[in-house]
Interface confidence: medium
């Protein structure tokens, strides 16, 4: 009686169980009553990462330098190429399909966390008492100058984008 299910690493075809091709190989022809499954290794720049009955290997991912990508890990016949971003860029998504320049924090915002290869710059608003007057991918919010410690007084209040302006204390003549 023909089988209705096959063992692991086998597949059912023409009422019989054939061996799957191992990772790194593709199917050329199914087994018959008299012959084994015929498999062939994937070509250069191709891969298959599972036991399979695929007739074509998958192409390795191309790490396109025009998209800021470079090879992090070269693909093999059993694994895909892994791309990552060039220095100063980060992936736009989990699969790292492309890269963008690290975001700068606008004036009034400081860098909370500097960007990495997979995550963008994280900005935070400068709280009261701090300012940032530049657009930067690494500058934190700076504290306002303390006029008192310089024996000066505040002549112009600070904002989240500007430092305080200190001046001499008014003295009685």
């Amino acid at each position: 009686e023909p089988p209705t299910a096959c063992r692991e690493k086998q597949y059912l075809i023409n009422s019989q169980c054939c061996s799957l091709c191992q990772p790194g190989q593709k199917l050329v022809s199914d087994c018959t009553e008299f012959t084994e499954t015929e498999c062939l290794p994937c070509g250069e720049s191709e891969f298959l990462d599972t036991w399979n009955r695929e007739t074509h290997c998958h192409q390795h991912k191309y790490c396109d330098p025009n998209l800021g990508l470079r090879v992090q890990q070269k693909g093999t016949s059993e694994t895909d190429t892994i791309c990552t971003c060039e220095e100063g860029w980060h992936c736009t998504s989990e699969a790292c399909e492309s890269c963008v320049l690290h975001r700068s924090c606008s004036p009034g915002f400081g860098v909370k966390q500097i960007a990495t290869g997979v995550s963008d710059t994280i900005c935070e608003p400068c709280p009261v008492g701090f300012f940032s007057n530049v657009s930067s991918a690494f500058e934190k919010c700076h504290p306002w100058t303390s006029c008192e410690t310089k024996d000066l007084v505040v002549q112009q209040a600070g904002t989240n984008k500007t430092d305080v302006v200190c001046g001499p204390q008014d003295r009685l003549r």
């Epitope: 990462d49 998958h58 192409q59 991912k61 998209l67 800021g68 895909d80 992936c91 736009t92 998504s93 989990e94 699969a95 790292c96 399909e97 492309s98 890269c99 963008v100 320049l101 690290h102 975001r103 700068s104 606008s106 995550s119 963008d120 994280i122």
Partner: antibody, heavy 115, light 112 residues
């Protein structure tokens, strides 16, 4: 051949759940992000959400409470479920490869919400 | 979500004209912006990503520029096959809980 194809019912009743499947070929879902986008008749494109190559899900704020996107890498399929549908959900639904760089799109499937 | 404001919404032009479409993002998205062309009854086609990088097979009359919040798509000399609707799409991603994504409202380029 590298391609993406959406499938599912063309007619859904109000308050039901819309279920669509996106079947891909020629590339591995574990190496790419997949997005769902819709386009109401005569209107612009609206991003619904995405599933990352590592399995993370991302939803538009309007869709968070109603949408579920999942992937079955063994079947080369990505699915979209949108609950509690109304006539406003009538649209062509597209599945596309990528996140912002949507370089491969399906032909789209029109879903009409009507009783 | 990120808001992307595209202008103009409609544009009448003649073959050979230079056409410019702008897209403004509600927050800094670096160069993470794509442009698409869509013809009636068809899915959109990727033209540019990121910001100024032409997708494979796209004619050189198309160009993109900008970064941060202001972006521009230019068609240097409009051809008959360029009459279509154009969309910008942008976003940023740092984690599953910190991301933004959106499309512009579209610009329909019609024959004058």
């Amino acid at each position: 051949q590298v391609q993406v194809q959406e499938s599912g019912p063309g007619l859904v009743k109000p308050s039901d759940t819309l279920s669509l499947t996106c079947t891909v070929s020629g590339f591995s879902l574990s190496s790419y992000d997949m997005s769902w986008i819709r386009q109401p008749p005569g209107k612009g494109l609206e991003w619904i959400g995405a599933i990352g190559g590592a399995g993370g899900t991302y939803y538009a704020s309007w869709a968070k409470s109603r949408v579920t996107i999942s992937v079955d890498t063994s079947l080369n399929q990505v699915s979209l479920k949108l609950s509690s549908v109304t006539a406003a959900d009538t649209a062509v639904y597209y599945c596309a490869r990528g996140w912002t760089r949507l370089d491969l799109w399906g032909q789209g499937t029109l879903v009409t919400v009507s009783s | 979500d990120i808001q992307l404001t595209q202008s103009p919404s409609f544009l009448s032009a003649s073959v050979g004209d230079r056409v410019t479409i702008t897209c403004q993002a509600s927050e800094d998205i670096s160069s993470n912006l794509a442009w698409y062309q869509q013809k009636p009854g068809k899915p959109p086609k990727l033209l540019i990503f990121p910001a100024s990088n032409l997708a494979s097979g796209v004619p050189s009359r198309f160009s993109g520029s900008g970064s941060g919040t202001e972006f521009t798509l230019t068609i240097s000399s409009l051809q008959p096959e360029d009459f279509a609707t154009y969309y910008c799409q942008g976003g940023y991603w740092t984690s599953t809980s910190n991301f933004g994504q959106g499309f512009g409202g579209g610009t329909k380029v019609e024959i004058k």
